[in-house]
């Protein structure tokens, strides 16, 4: 699902207040709800009728440093006999997510939000076939 | 997929540098890659064999203010005849994502990262049945 544009309002102070100096804001250390964890089916990526593989990208100047991307294994879906059925399609499910980018020059460290597109998994869909003109 | 704990290292300055004052950091305004957009199959949530509905949660002190959660419509999966088959299960695909929480007292505005669990969609899996005791 998509993240709307910042629109330069969310991160601004109320109009009656002095503006933010130097185009930066105060970000408190620590993460709210840091201990929350996903609770998905075990080996969901292998048991799905639209199975997928995971690829890990790593960047030490990004938080989280590890971002995992899914890729659908097949074009079709896996039927009850374990065979690929191309009358149905395996398609990726994407999500827009935020990460934090770290920028440093010597002892001057600043951070900036970055939008990343993550493919989270795959689902099996009925293909849409448009009529030939 | 899961976001690791901050571990108090990513947001710290190098050891040779003076510590961050008051437990906060500098967050630059603006979002990198803000114009990136998801490119998913149209009506994927209705065409899937594990279809889902979307629920929107809204919070003006969160960025993004709108967070969309998916919920699987069925417990089973939809077969070729359009009937629900409970020998297969529709299961949620979850993603840990970051949002920004805005906290203000008068003209003093600060921000903090928050971890949110988002159900992005659903996929159809073979259920795992463990041995009866």
């Amino acid at each position: 699902r998509k993240i709307p544009k910042v629109g330069h309002t969310f991160f601004q102070k109320p109009e009656s207040c002095p503006p933010v100096p130097g185009g930066s804001m105060k970000l408190d250390i620590g993460i709210i709800n840091e201990n929350q964890r996903v609770s998905m089916s075990r080996n969901i990526e292998s048991r799905s009728t639209s199975p997928w593989n995971y690829t890990v990208t790593w960047d030490p100047n990004r938080y989280p440093s590890e971002v995992v991307q899914a890729q659908c294994r097949n074009l079709g879906c896996i039927n009850a006999q374990g065979k690929e059925d191309i009358s149905m399609n395996s398609v990726p499910i994407q999500q827009e997510t935020l990460v934090v980018r770290r920028k440093h020059q010597g002892c001057s460290v600043s951070f900036q939000l970055e939008k990343v597109l993550v493919t989270v998994g795959c689902t099996c869909v009925t293909p849409v076939i448009h009529h030939v003109q | 997929r899961k976001i690791p704990k901050v571990g108090h290292t990513f947001f710290q300055k190098p050891e040779s540098c003076p510590p961050v004052p008051g437990g906060s950091m500098k967050l630059d305004i603006g979002i990198i890659n803000e114009n990136q957009r998801v490119s998913m199959s149209r009506n994927i949530e209705s065409r899937s064999t594990s279809p889902w509905n979307y629920t929107v949660t809204w919070d003006p002190n969160r960025y993004p203010s709108e967070v969309v959660q998916a919920q699987c419509r069925n417990l089973g999966c939809i077969n070729a005849q359009g009937k629900e088959d409970i020998s297969m299960n529709s299961v949620p695909i979850q993603q840990e994502t970051l949002v920004v929480r805005r906290k203000h007292q008068g003209c003093s505005v600060s921000f903090q990262l928050e971890k949110v669990l988002v159900t992005v969609g659903c996929t159809c899996v073979t259920p795992v049945i463990h041995h009866v005791q």
């Epitope: 089916s41 075990r42 | 417990l75 259920p127 795992v128 049945i129 463990h130």
Partner: nanobody, 118 residues
Framework: EVQLVESGGGLVQAGGSLRLSCVAS????????MGWFRQAPGMEREFVAL????????GYVDSVKGRFTISRDNAKNTVYLQMNSLKPEDTAVYYC???????????WGQGTQVTVSS
């Protein structure tokens, strides 16, 4: 650990009714889905009915649709299976199952015998 205890099975004539109950207990019980499956002698296990704990959404195998109803009582941590218009082919051991993680039925009861005579 989650414990599931079924009751309500028995011998009934074709066309009769039974109501099975499954009480869930254990540390911090919170299941995604609970359900009933059955196994007749020499047959594969089959899911009969499922219910999502959070919102009560249900699913049934075709052979019991319109005859069986699954329901839950959150306050009592109990799931019920109301079985009407029973047929001899419904004879089986009925097991209660819980999936704390979606699709992973890690917890099972000991089973209750249902016998439908003609």
């Amino acid at each position: 650990e989650v414990q599931l205890v079924e009751s309500g099975g028995g011998l009934v004539q074709a066309g009769g009714s039974l109501r099975l109950s499954c009480v869930a207990s254990g540390r911090a019980f919170s299941s995604y889905v609970m359900g009933w499956f059955r196994q007749a002698p020499g047959m594969e296990r089959e899911f009969v009915a499922l219910i999502r704990w959070s919102d009560g959404i249900t699913g049934y195998v075709d052979s019991v649709k319109g005859r069986f109803t699954i329901s839950r009582d959150n306050a009592k941590n109990t799931v019920y299976l109301q079985m009407n218009s029973l047929k001899p082919e419904d004879t089986a051991v009925y097991y209660c199952a819980a999936a704390v993680r979606p699709g992973d039925y890690d917890y099972w009861g000991q089973g209750t015998q249902v016998t439908v005579s003609s």
